[in-house]
């Protein structure tokens, strides 16, 4: 039975040209995390962090994506096209797959504040 829950940074905003940290956290389960996948807009793999093999940033994103902190992901040099949904998928044993969602809004305004709070989606 899947007892875990994913907490994420929820809805966040950041400045164009700036950076943002995407974070998910799996709690309330003893399951072993074998791999975490990060996806953009549900159809592009950004990065994978495999427990045994470490991090891989996919070629199309190598210039703008940095691994961490932890199992999170840092997006750099943000553009307006980066606005949208991001998904963390936790592959675990024996529970199976947990998935969290973050919505990022990239703002033109110089007064845009990076708001990040943990919430259960």
């Amino acid at each position: 039975m899947m007892t875990g829950t994913i907490e994420t940074t929820g809805n966040i905003s950041a400045k164009k040209g700036g950076s943002v940290i995407l974070q998910c956290h799996l709690s309330s389960t003893m399951a072993q995390v074998t791999q975490v996948n990060w996806e953009q807009h549900d159809h592009s793999l950004l990065a994978i962090r495999n427990a045994e093999l470490g991090w891989h940033i996919y070629p199309a994103f190598k210039d703008r994506v940095a691994p961490g902190p932890g199992l999170g992901l840092t997006l750099q040099s943000l553009t307006m096209n980066d606005t949208g949904e991001y998904f963390c998928t936790y592959h675990t044993y024996p529970d199976g797959t947990y998935r969290g969602r973050i919505f990022l809004e990239v703002l033109e305004s110089s007064v845009a504040e990076h708001s990040a709070r943990f919430q259960i989606p």
Partner: antibody, heavy 117, light 107 residues
Framework: EVQLVQSGAEVKKPGASVKVSCKAS????????IEWVRQAPGQRLEWMGV????????NYKEKFKGRVTITADKSSSTAYMELSSLRSEDTAVYYC??????????WGQGTTVTVSS | DIVMTQSPDSLAVSLGERATINCKAS??????VAWYQHKPGQSPKLLIY???YRYTGVPDRFSGSGSGTDFTLTISSLQAEDVAVYYC?????????FGGGTKVEIK
Amino acid sequence: EVQLVQSGAEVKKPGASVKVSCKASGYAFTNYLIEWVRQAPGQRLEWMGVINPGSGGTNYKEKFKGRVTITADKSSSTAYMELSSLRSEDTAVYYCARGEYFFFDYWGQGTTVTVSS
Amino acid sequence: DIVMTQSPDSLAVSLGERATINCKASQHVSDGVAWYQHKPGQSPKLLIYSASYRYTGVPDRFSGSGSGTDFTLTISSLQAEDVAVYYCQQHYNTPHTFGGGTKVEIK
């Protein structure tokens, strides 16, 4: 030029072990994964496992756990795949491949392993 | 394990015509699909990764598309040297799994 050169064909008896080598050249050995894939006669390609030569970390397909061991020697830029308790169903061509993480951009020439009594 | 189902099993196409191969994943794999060409007596060769990115040196008649669970490899104008077996592979999660292969021949 990137090259992966594998050891020669092997004929083994059931219950025996086989160790296939894969010597890499033309790139930084520790910057890429080495994956092992096999193809039995008339079957699809089957991924067996992978090693990160830099860290030594490995990941195996569940069905091979306990029977396969993948190692890497950084000093000689060589990876090894040892499969034990061989059975007739292990008769196959065994490939090593360089992993651009989880897809495979260069492949060895293949090593035919025949298991027969 | 994620099951990759390819169709058709074989395909006969006239020279210069289009060949289309489909691959369906048993669960969501985002764009984590690669395509390989395998000729008899040779090692497999990477054509496409991340569903649609053509690997270095691969002719532009080869293209890939799809995301989620449904993927396609297209050879826009079949050449004699394209006769081979083509495999899809998911690189979304371990164990990495391959489709059953599609044999492409000249009609």
